[in-house]
């Protein structure tokens, strides 16, 4: 079983970053950390999408990784997509320092995110609390600014 993974985020614009993943035990939480730069100040949706396909850019990654066929939610919600990691927060300089611990994603098994795509979005994720159908699917987080396939790290 892989215990470490990494993702290099790139897009058409200025947004780029490196995100690391570590899971010390197969059923334990995954630590997610790293930095993303080139963002506008504020919150940006942060999700693992289903496919590790970036052939046509970030749109090829498909919808949120959702093997349990649940509604979109926030990372602390029981009802959420596996890939729902909430929001990252960019400062005035456009830098988001990411530090997340999540117990739903995994680096092995049915919830394995390796080989899938990590995406940072244009807008804040409303965590499934909004008033339209899209809120229950994507959180209205808007376009995909940057993405990368999550790979095994040594």
């Amino acid at each position: 079983m892989a215990t470490k993974a990494v993702c290099v985020l790139k897009g058409d614009g200025p947004v780029q970053g490196i995100i690391n993943f570590e899971q010390k035990e197969s059923n334990g939480p995954v630590k997610v950390w790293g930095s993303i730069k080139g963002l506008t100040e504020g919150l940006h949706g942060f999700h693992v999408h289903e496919f590790g396909d970036n052939t046509a850019g970030c749109t090829s990654a498909g919808p949120h990784f959702n093997p349990l066929s649940r509604k979109h939610g926030g990372p602390k919600d029981e009802e959420r997509h596996v890939g729902d990691l909430g929001n990252v927060t960019a400062d005035k300089d456009g830098v988001a320092d990411v530090s997340i611990e999540d117990s739903v994603i995994s680096l092995s098994g049915d919830h394995c995110i390796i080989g899938r795509t990590l995406v940072v979005h244009e807008k804040a994720d409303d965590l499934g609390k909004g008033g339209n159908e899209e809120s229950t699917k994507t959180g209205n987080a808007g376009s995909r600014l940057a993405c990368g396939v999550i790979g095994i790290a040594q």
Epitope: L43, K71, A124, D126, G128, G130, G131, G142
Partner: antibody, heavy 116, light 107 residues
Framework: EVQLVESGGGLVQPGGSLRLSCAAS????????MSWVRQAPGKGLEWVAN????????DYVDSVKGRFTISRDNAKNSLYLQMNSLRAEDTAVYYC?????????WGQGTLVTVSS | VIWMTQSPSLLSASTGDRVTISCRMS??????LAWYQQKPGKAPELLIY???TLQSGVPSRFSGSGSGTDFTLTISSLQSEDFATYYC?????????FGQGTKLEIK
């Protein structure tokens, strides 16, 4: 077509109680957070309370905490607001709306008047 | 609590005019902002959410912009049915609050 229809408003004395209902149709009610928003006569809008799609979480504006209770029955596609210990300042049109933090379709509203 | 200042409170304009309504926050709210229109005796209707996303069925003459603490609703060419009261609303932090409203009246 999404429809939200409120009922249960009326005239009540200070200290009294009322239960508002909202009947929802035209969408999968159990998939959405829902809210109550009120508007005092001639005034602006005030969010009152919300409830998660499965009823497991609720939030309230401070001014109604401990007096109002939001609930839902997904089998009946219905949202409720139990209002106790009513005060004159609770006088308003109460709207049911889809969404927990921002609000898509709204109902037509039901008027609650608290007066002796 | 996030305090919101919506301006102007009253706006007089003519059909065909381009008008803007401003909403300023006491702190940054990212993209957690919505706009609503309300006509007398009617329920509010959602126009825009997430700062700039137009609700389905809302005419394209309505647009939203801004970031951080300063946001704007623009109507590019006023139609007679646009004379109403407009509210901004933040959903960044609890309690979710509305601006005090802007009444758009016929000049």
């Amino acid at each position: 077509e999404v429809q939200l229809v409120e009922s249960g408003g009326g005239l009540v004395q200070p200290g009294g109680s009322l239960r508002l209902s909202c009947a929802a149709s035209g969408f999968t009610f159990s998939s959405f957070w829902m809210s109550w928003v009120r508007q005092a006569p001639g005034k602006g809008l005030e969010w009152v309370a919300n409830i998660k799609h499965d009823g497991s979480e609720q939030d309230y504006v401070d001014s109604v905490k401990g007096r109002f209770t939001i609930s839902r029955d997904n089998a009946k596609n219905s949202l409720y607001l139990q209002m106790n210990s009513l005060r004159a300042e609770d006088t308003a049109v109460y709207y049911c709306a889809r969404g927990g933090i921002w609000f898509g379709p709204w109902g037509q509203g039901t008027l609650v008047t608290v007066s002796s | 609590v996030i305090w919101m200042t919506q301006s102007p409170s009253l706006l007089s304009a003519s059909t065909g005019d381009r008008v803007t309504i401003s909403c300023r926050m006491s702190q940054g709210i990212s993209s957690y902002l919505a706009w609503y229109q309300q006509k007398p005796g009617k329920a509010p209707e959602l126009l825009i959410y997430a700062v700039s996303t137009l609700q389905s069925g809302v005419p394209s003459r309505f647009s939203g912009s801004g970031s951080g603490t300063d946001f704007t609703l623009t109507i590019s060419s006023l139609q007679s049915e646009d004379f109403a009261t407009y509210y901004c609303q933040q959903y960044y932090s609890f309690p979710y609050t509305f601006g005090q409203g802007t009444k758009l009246e016929i000049k």
